[in-house]
């Protein structure tokens, strides 16, 4: 422990200028004080001043008030330092002396005489509050105050608790009156050495080395480190754990860079035509009447739909057409006839039936012919019956659909699994993806279909971590790590809570 007993002498009155022995001072009592502080004694006895002692210079003659903080050892209040735990009790002896000698060091002068003395015994707690007292005898009066305070960096009831404020690597704190630590703003912990991170900084995914900071751990980003970083190269996807790439709607592939909804994203079909998606970046435009081309971008001739019947010839006009009817026919589309069955109007073996009491007729056409006079051969492809970009072909009385790769069925309406044809050689595993099959090859093979035998085995160096299975073969010298539950990453090096949906390609 360490502290200071402080004594403030306030006023001394010796109006008659008398010594303790009854003699008077000549010309007056030039007064200094001796103070002795010791352990508590029920009866004060001579002997060493165990807690310390101090003397003052001459402070005045006979009666005087002490207001200055005098220089040297005469500082007011007088200081009695101690280097032990304050016991809470004490004995104090204050003696007033007259000196005929030196003002500053009267203690050393011969012929000093006692004027009076007082003895105080009791208890005193450590604190800043002064205890004020006054002692009288027949000749003199002394008023004074005293207290015990702790030395710098010492605290507590007995000045035994050491605490030194600091603001460095080992702590950031001030000291409370009882010596306990009070952390500076932004710091916490037993020794106030733990920074308080930015409010909201994720407990697991972020950390800090100074207050109001938030440094992200690998795989996390954002001001509060609460946003995961998706797999490198992930284009149209998100993550819920680091290094994931969960595709947005309409996108596919390992990096979500394959457009599965080309129609919505790009609107390639023009002039009100209908767009149908057909695999990554694949689509088909179904045109409205009067339009043609891959994107229905070409406007057909107004006559293209053969609107003129009964052999009428069609002439294009601005925004319209005009039918030139053959003899015996009239009307906008040459649909009205002046002929009767007697004129044999039905072609291609069509049967003529009279109507309206013989004033008109109707032809009943044999199979594969149509038109009011059975003059047209039936085209079974006009209705665009083939789906998914299939080509329609007339085959005599019927028609067939020629399907694009990957589709089958009468109208090419069925999607064939690419893996159904077992495209992977040498025991490779086939994955049916939107843009075609992907093969993961066994060790020693590579290529799109595991058709290439490789001398260098990319898996030989054991590049996969955490018990993952290594495959080669997506392309020469490449390998794939198939991660066990709880790990992701190109080498299965990152622990997570969920299994990857597909092995990562290194």
């Amino acid at each position: 422990g360490s502290g200071i007993f402080q004594l403030r002498l306030q006023e001394f009155v010796n109006q008659r200028g008398m010594l303790a022995n009854g003699q008077s001072c000549e010309p007056g009592c030039r007064t200094f004080f001796r103070i002795c502080l010791k352990h508590f004694q029920a009866t004060f006895s001579e002997g060493p001043c165990t807690f310390g002692n101090v003397s003052t210079p001459v402070l005045g003659t006979n009666s005087f008030v002490v207001r200055d903080k005098n220089s040297g050892s005469g500082r007011n209040p007088l200081q009695l330092p101690f280097n032990f735990t304050w016991p809470g009790t004490f004995s104090l002896n204050i003696q007033a002396w007259h000196t005929p000698g030196d003002d500053l060091r009267p203690e050393t002068s011969p012929g000093n005489s006692l004027i009076s003395q007082i003895i105080i015994q009791g208890s005193l707690a450590v604190g800043k509050i002064w205890r004020t007292d006054e002692q009288n005898d027949t000749l003199t009066r002394l008023s004074y105050s005293y207290r015990v305070i702790c030395s710098d960096n010492y605290y507590g009831e007995s000045c035994s608790r050491l605490c030194k404020k600091r603001d460095d690597h080992f702590g950031h704190y001030e000291c409370q009156p009882d010596g306990s630590l009070s952390c500076l703003p932004g710091w916490t912990g037993k020794y106030c050495d733990q920074p308080i991170c930015l409010s909201g900084c994720h407990e697991q995914n972020g950390y800090c080395s100074k207050p109001d900071e938030c440094i992200c751990r690998p795989g996390w980003q954002g001001r509060l480190c609460n946003e995961c970083i998706p797999h490198n190269g992930c284009r149209h996807g998100t993550c819920s754990i680091p290094w994931q790439c969960a595709c947005d709607e309409g996108w596919g592939g390992l990096f979500c860079d394959q457009d599965l909804n080309y129609c919505t994203h790009h609107s390639p079909c023009k002039n009100g035509s209908t767009c149908s998606n057909s695999g990554p970046k694949g689509y088909t435009c179904t045109c409205l009447p009067g339009y043609t081309g891959e994107h229905c971008e070409l406007g057909l001739s107004k006559c293209a739909s053969n609107p003129c019947r009964n052999g009428g010839s069609c002439k294009d006009q601005e925004n319209s057409y005009h039918c030139l009817c053959p003899p015996g026919y009239y009307g906008q589309h040459c649909e009205h006839s002046t002929l009767t069955c007697a004129d044999s109007p039905c072609f291609n073996g069509g049967s003529c039936r009279e109507r309206n009491q013989g004033s008109s007729y109707a032809c009943e056409c044999p199979p594969n012919f149509t038109g009011s006079n059975c003059e047209k051969k039936v085209d079974r492809c006009t209705s665009n019956p083939c789906a998914n970009g299939g080509q329609c072909q007339n085959r005599g009385p019927s028609r067939t659909c020629r399907c694009r790769p990957g589709f089958t069925g009468t109208h090419c309406e069925l999607h064939i699994s690419d893996c159904a044809r077992s495209p992977c050689a040498h025991g490779g595993t086939c994955h049916d993806l939107e843009n075609g099959p992907v093969c993961t090859c066994p060790a020693g093979f590579s290529g799109r279909r595991c058709e290439v035998r490789i001398t260098h085995d990319a898996c030989a160096s054991g590049p996969c971590f955490n018990g993952a299975t290594c495959y080669t073969g997506l392309s020469p010298n490449n390998f794939v790590c198939n991660c066990p539950y709880g790990f992701v990453g190109s080498r299965c090096e990152f622990p997570v809570g969920l299994p990857p949906s597909f092995p990562w390609v290194a």
Epitope: Q10, F64, V65, R67, D68, N70, W130, D133, S143, S145
Partner: antibody, heavy 121, light 104 residues
Amino acid sequence: EVQLQESGPGLVKPSETLSLTCTVSGGSISSSSYYWGWIRQPPGKGLEWIGDIYYAGSTYYNPSLKDRVTISVDTSKNQFSLKLSSVTAADTAVYYCAREDMILGGGADNWGQGTLVTVSS
Amino acid sequence: SYELTQPPSVSVSPGQTASITCSGDRLGDKYVSWYQQKPGQSPVLVIYEDSERPSGIPERFSGSNSGDTATLTISGTQAMDEADYYCQAWDSEAGVFGSGTKVT
């Protein structure tokens, strides 16, 4: 809380004696921790310490006023008084009574509100 | 007789620091008190024993005393601190006030 209140005439004729009393309430004037003092302030000027007294009777005065000043204490009434003789116009001032706390190094921690005394015929 | 000298005035912007000096022969050997006085009011003790603050006085008031000069410092000065400031010391048994400084 201790309060101090000055009282006395606001007008004094030149050459006469100025007399003021300070009444202490809310605490005892007989405390050994305090001196009871008088300070004055001429209009538009600074503060000037006049003197003080201990409850037991000890008095201390400004050397420049020592010959004209008397300060006394009446512990039974909890009052202390100032007498300034042979006044001139230069003694016109606001007079304050104050409590000087020895524990505060003699700092005056309580003041009266002050009373203006004009010296004029 | 003992004299304490203060500058007549000190100007400071709000939020800045104001320093008022008080000079006297070997003033560092004496205890210095500082008082604030606003127009029409009694003085208020703001610093005692060179650097101690009475209860109720804001922390922005601080004091120091060494050699021949004592200083009152007001850090982060506020509009309400505009006032006259007086230093005071004890010369033997008599009190002495400084001439006063107007802080604006």
